[in-house]
């Protein structure tokens, strides 16, 4: 056969699926790759075929499109499986092709299994919600295009292996659940089981999300340094290991990138012709609220060393902030038979 | 095909307990939750409890909550309701019923329980 | 626990009549509402879950209404094999209860 694009294996496009529910898959091609969408394809003449590869096998079969029930069909650019069987697992790919063109991609699927808490192999998104924040709402995902307007769903909401029922703060909306005030408590996954009929057969689609209860806007301030502050000096004698940590706490912020770093006299260390280095550790709070560490490090300081300015540096989307260490060169000891009996005028 | 297929009738004497099984075929057992409904002789159906087999919980009407257990055996596939301290009113058709999404679209054949003294 | 009342407790009718039987909450149930038919016997049967929707293959004659605490199911031509025992159930908060069941018989 003629040349054709190849776009290879879209890994990036990592399908999961449950077993015995239905999903719809569009072809990648027109989302990630071609600079044209289903509709101006077919009006061009160009026709989107689909086959697979089963998983552990290499020999790419075509789609059979002529079960029972219809079990899978295409409809546009549209991979339906009403529902899915855990055999379906494997590599699927669409081309786009007529006489004089050819672009195809392939992409995999996995078929999963659940269990009756929900628990399976799947990815789970993430959703923040404010801690102490108001009333707030989570939206059952991906159901959209399983179902025309005029079906009227059941939706059942879950908090890990529990119905929400007579939750005091949690309530369920038909495709939405509303937290009326969310805590640390409400941490776990919640699962919303939609439940429609089409053509005279009845489908289920699940749906699990993770809600993360962060730090509220509210509440949030500009970063702060904890370390260096106006109680600790850095008193070193030259040849000694000087370590001054940069302690800095960032609020949680939607989005927002926090940033620390260090200043040696107004220079990135990497500008400063000395042996610095800086080790980062970073950990975090029950509502996600950040503390950053940088220990900047000079294994063996110098008397020039010790006379720079050292500042720490933090920024976040409430501000930026600085602070400078207070070094100094310790004075030796004083040696008594000199110094002190200097001290005390003797002759 | 999926399948729920429950014991055999049973005849005890009040104050006795019984225990009735519910064996599933045809699906991945701990995908699912099994509930327990009874029928008295002539009259509506009621609701006794359910079983999610993953994570072992059950909940119960509290009109039986100190006399049943409901659990589920994984390696078998098998749901069990066990009606202690029996009496006359407790006899009824038992049945189990799968469900998920809040469907019970599947049903035992059900088990006649005739407590007589 | 939610009470469902429902009516009549039985009816008679013939092949053709368009039957109606309701369902109501104590309390508000939402759309939470499942239809159960029963023949002698035997279990019971899924037609109507989430209040309007008919489960697999349950014959368009049967149709379910209704939301928060009335509901209502309609047999809209009766058929020979519908003579049994239909059962409202709320699946809405535990415990889960039915109505007591309504008995249509052949007139």
């Known amino acids: 056969s003629e040349r054709c694009d190849d776009w290879g294996l879209d890994t990036m496009r990592q399908i999961q699926v449950f077993e015995d529910e239905p999903a719809r898959i569009k072809c990648p091609l027109f989302e990630h790759f071609l600079k044209f969408n289903y509709s101006t394809a077919h009006s061009a003449g160009l026709t989107l075929i689909w086959y697979w590869t089963r998983q552990d096998r290499d020999l790419e079969e075509p789609i059979n499109f002529r079960l029972p029930e219809n079990r899978i069909s295409k409809e546009k650019d549209v991979l339906w499986f009403r529902p899915t069987l855990l055999n379906d697992t494997g590599n699927y790919t669409c081309m786009l092709r007529n006489t004089t063109y050819c672009s195809k991609v392939a992409f995999p699927l996995e078929v999963v299994q659940k269990d009756s808490c929900f628990n399976s192999p799947m990815k789970l998104p993430v959703h923040k919600l404010y801690i102490e924040y108001g009333i707030q709402r989570i939206t059952c995902p991906n159901v959209d295009g399983y179902f025309p307007s005029s079906v009227k769903p059941t939706i059942t909401w879950y908090m890990g292996c529990y119905k929400i029922q007579n939750f005091n703060n949690v309530i369920p909306e038909g495709m939405n659940l509303s937290f009326l005030i969310a805590f640390i408590s409400n941490n776990g996954n919640y699962t919303c089981v939609v439940t429609y009929p089409e053509n005279g057969r009845t489908f289920h689609l699940t749906r699990t999300l993770t809600v993360k209860v962060v730090g509220s806007p509210k509440n949030a301030v500009p970063p702060v340094i904890h370390s260096p502050n106006d109680h600790v000096v850095y008193e070193k004698e030259p040849g000694e290991e000087l370590l001054i940590p940069c302690t800095v706490y960032f609020s949680f912020l939607m989005d927002s990138r926090n940033e620390v770093w260090w200043t040696i006299d107004g220079k990135k260390p990497d500008d400063i012709p000395i042996d610095v280095t800086i080790n980062e550790s970073i950990s975090h709070s029950r509502t996600e609220d950040e503390t950053r560490t940088q220990i900047l490090s000079i294994k063996k300081v110098t008397s020039e060393d010790l006379k720079r300015s050292y500042v720490c540096h933090a920024r976040s989307a409430k501000g930026e902030v600085a602070k400078a260490a207070t070094v100094k060169q310790k004075v030796p000891a004083p040696r008594y038979t000199v110094e002190l009996a200097c001290g005390f005028g003797a002759t | 095909e999926v399948q729920l297929v429950q014991s055999g009738a049973e005849v005890k004497k009040p104050g006795s307990s019984v225990k009735v099984s519910c064996k599933a075929s045809g699906y991945t057992f701990n995908s699912y939750w099994i509930h327990w409904v009874r029928q008295a002789p002539g009259q509506g159906l009621e609701w006794m409890g359910y079983?999610?087999?993953?994570?072992?919980?059950?909940e119960y009407n509290q009109k039986f909550t100190d006399r049943v257990t409901i659990t589920a055996d994984k390696s078998t596939s098998t749901a069990y309701m066990e009606l202690s301290s029996l009496r006359s009113e407790d006899t009824a058709v038992y049945y189990c019923?799968?469900?998920?999404?809040?469907?019970?679209?599947?049903w035992g054949q059900g088990t006649l329980v005739t407590v007589s003294s | 626990a939610i009470q469902m009342t429902q009516s009549p407790s039985s009816l008679s009718a013939s092949v053709g009549d368009r039957v109606t039987i309701t369902c109501k909450a104590s309390?508000?149930?939402?759309?939470?509402v499942s239809w159960f038919q029963q023949k002698p016997g035997k279990s019971p049967k899924l037609l109507i879950y989430?209040?309007?929707n008919r489960y697999t293959g349950v014959p368009s004659r049967f149709s379910g209404s209704g939301s928060a605490t009335d509901f209502t199911l309609t047999i809209s031509s009766l058929q020979p094999e519908d003579f049994a025992t239909y059962h409202c159930g709320q699946i809405y908060i535990y415990p889960y209860t039915f109505g007591g069941g309504t008995k249509v018989e052949i007139k």
């Open positions: 309390e508000n149930v939402g759309y939470s």
């Open positions: 019923a799968r469900e998920y999404g809040d469907l019970f679209a599947y």
């Open positions: 989430g209040a309007s």
């Open positions: 079983n999610n087999p993953t994570s072992g919980y059950s």
